[in-house]
Interface confidence: medium
């Protein structure tokens, strides 16, 4: 099991942070980055609902991303594999109170952040 | 359902030791940091000592620092705390807590320390 | 270590009323990672504390919405917009931010 800061929660080898603050999706991914950790990267359907009942009602920012007319994909590069849909036109991903929608990266919302736990 | 309990708690005589214990169900224990908290009519509340998942960090209060040891078995689903040297200002009832981000979001119901002569 | 104080000490209210406590630290309680360790607790006669409010402003989960957190820096607010015969008790302010980890010496509610 995860052995996570103790501002952060362990899930299956994750931790993840959730703020309380706002940010764009750039700022966000910086604010992460500077944590050793990438904005949230959700592999598993366990995991999302996790997610969901942890980050309350507010938006959260995650790490999907796609350029015009290109697939999503997560912060490391890899692609989504459609896990859960994605609602809306934007470029960037968030996880609203239903599940995950997507807006332009400037909007600012919460985030989270997750990073594997390498202390396991 | 999430339940904390403790057990342990007694009379003792100031300079004596006792181990308090709390059982954990209903949750993955080793996912969560745990608390110590203590209360007294007088002072309150009273945050005692915290422990991360793996045990591998622990923070204490001042006034206990050198006399007591929390200590958790995550296979046991259990967290200690040993109380040696103890004193008159340190009768309570101390309870367990579940931390989540950096909150105390789950509490035992207790268990009464007397140190008396 | 942060002083957390608690005004009123104690206050009555009406049934069905609003009720406000409020919490002063004595220094800032924004964390270096942009978040605020400031908690809430209910405690009544007999029982442990129970959470309502965690960060400043979450509604712990199962928590009615007649409870609702807000403040920043060392100011802060637990409102309850209508209140029951089951809120009596005592709250406490528990902030989270600095070591050690400190609460407030409480608000006693009761119904006048």
């Known amino acids: 099991q995860a052995a996570c800061p103790e501002s952060w929660i362990g899930f299956q080898r994750k931790c993840f942070y959730f703020s309380d603050d706002t940010k764009n999706w750039t700022s966000s991914q910086r604010f992460c980055d500077s944590q050793d950790a990438d904005l949230a990267q959700v592999e598993s359907f366990q995991e999302l609902n996790f997610l969901l009942r942890y980050k309350g009602p507010s938006d959260h920012w995650i790490g999907l991303s796609r350029e015009q007319g290109q697939p999503w994909k997560w912060i490391n590069g890899t692609e989504w594999t459609r896990q859960f849909p994605i609602l809306g036109a934007g470029e960037c991903a968030y996880l609203n109170d239903k599940g995950a929608s997507s807006a332009r990266h400037y909007t600012e919302r919460k985030w989270i952040c997750s990073k594997s736990d390498i202390h396991v | 359902q999430i339940t904390l309990k403790e057990s342990g708690g007694g009379l003792v005589q100031p300079g004596g030791s006792l181990r308090l214990s709390c059982t954990v169900s209903?949750?993955?224990?080793?996912?969560?940091?745990m608390t110590w908290v203590r209360q007294t009519p007088g002072k309150g509340l009273e945050w005692v000592a915290n422990?991360?998942?793996?045990?591998?960090?622990?923070h204490y209060v001042d006034s206990v620092k050198g006399r007591f040891t929390i200590s958790r078995d995550n296979a046991e689903n259990s967290l200690y705390l040993q109380m040696n040297s103890l004193r008159g200002e340190d009768t309570a009832v101390y309870y367990c807590?579940?931390?989540?981000?950096?909150?105390?979001?789950?509490w035992g119901q207790g268990t009464l320390v007397t140190v008396s002569s | 270590d942060i002083v957390m104080t608690h005004t009123p000490l104690s206050s009555p209210v009406t049934l069905g009323q609003p009720a406000s406590i409020s919490c002063r630290s004595s220094q800032s309680l924004e964390h270096t990672d942009g978040n605020t360790y400031l908690s809430w607790l209910h405690q009544r006669p007999g029982q442990p504390p129970r959470l309502l409010i965690y960060k400043v402003s979450t509604r712990f989960s199962g928590v009615p919405d007649r409870f609702s957190g807000s403040g920043a820096g060392t100011d802060f607010t637990l409102k309850i917009s209508r209140v029951e015969a089951e809120d009596v008790g005592v709250y406490y302010c528990?902030?989270?931010?600095?070591?050690?980890?400190?609460f407030g010496h409480g608000t006693k509610v009761e119904i006048k």
């Open positions: 807590a579940r931390n989540s981000q950096r909150s105390f979001d789950y």
């Open positions: 528990v902030q989270a931010t600095h070591y050690p980890r400190t």
């Open positions: 209903g949750f993955t224990f080793s996912n969560n940091w």
């Open positions: 422990i991360k998942q793996d045990g591998t960090e622990k």
